[in-house]
Interface confidence: medium
Amino acid sequence: AGTPPGKAFNLTWISADFKTILAWQPKPTNYTYTVQISTKSGDWKYKCTGTTDTECALTDEIVKDVKQTYLARVLSVPWRNSTHGKETLFGTHGEEPPFTNAPEFTPYLETNLGAPTIQSFEQVGTKVNVTVEDERTLVRRNNTFLSLRDVFGKDLIYTLAYWKSSSSGAKTAATNTNEFLIDVDKGENYCFSVQAVIPSRTVNRASTDSPVECMGQEHHHHHH
């Protein structure tokens, strides 16, 4: 009958701005993997059937409703059963192949925030308006892709660190829109970096910093 397939372990959700994969170990030898995903009240859906990879893209499933809690499991399927689709995933006596459950995953609560991008900054006198790009996600509504702000609404804020090019002491500001209006000293050039933050989260609360943008490198009215 051959060696029974090994069970997957270290099942991990890897998710940034809702782009989501499930990863696991080990690399299979005489068997393949099939992933199943469902909501708590839904039916199992087959993904990555018969794969020898150790990851499976599940973005298209979780973006259907990012506030749902998703269950997933990785089935280890012997070669003889893995080549003809799900009808033959089960053994000749109908037994279920070995599987490992992934931790529950609620995208809205857990997806990592990707580093934001400073879209533009514009100085008028002693004020600078810094605009953060409203990043598009893969979450759809009415056939259009929603931005991070569309999805998270008032749960999302941005924080800005800014400092004079000639010094290292940074000041900070926060906004629950995508724009900052800050006071600066006339004749000084400033550098800026922003972070996306969901203050009421306990995990994956903040993104990494955006790339630093500085005034005076091109001109004060600066657009990407």
């Epitope: 009240s41 506030k67 609620t106 809205y108 008032k154 749960d155 969901i198 203050p199 009421s200 989260r201």
Partner: antibody, heavy 118, light 107 residues
Amino acid sequence: EVQLVQSGAEVKKPGASVKVSCKASGYSFTGYYMNWVRQAPGQGLEWMGEINPSTGGSTYNQKFKARVTMTVDQSTSTVYMELSSLRSEDTAVYYCARRELGGPFGYWGQGTTVTVSS
Amino acid sequence: SIVMTQSPDSLAVSLGERATINCKASQSVSNGIAWYQQKPGQSPKLLIYFASNRYTGVPDRFSGSGYGTDFTLTISSLQAEDVAVYYCQQDYSSPWTFGGGTKVEIK
């Protein structure tokens, strides 16, 4: 430990105003919206509005918009709800409640009883 | 605004038996539903959010289900301390609205 401590009971005459306070502790005050919910005697729960302690911006239930004002004092981690032009049907227990990520109210104050009577 | 209708208004269940409370939204709220428990003289307590997620510290005899317009709170084995009024609330669209409440008692 997260705590929301509200001010004491109030008795008011019709037409007067009442200002209820809610002092927060045990968490990052500016990170969570604060909501106000009221409950008339023997009745259900009714949402009045919410305030962002970080900016002071507020959103009100249309029903109360003309009469309610929510404010914040960051220095004392306190939010306030003032209701004006009181009438007998405003007799209720008024709760402050912290809005959790995604919308639900995870922590509630102990409630403040407001009685409107001539 | 979205109207939340709870049923039944009251429910008497024997200790150890299952209690089921229903909540219907006047339009789809996706899974934007929370359930609260309120004991006499106390503030409400959050039990369930996102329709089916148990809040921190909530016993696993409490479970929620549903999507769209129809939702259910189930207490799988009623305990004496579960006597309370239970409310559903939609947090999908402002103004946030609550159901009228269901009183759960011991039979």
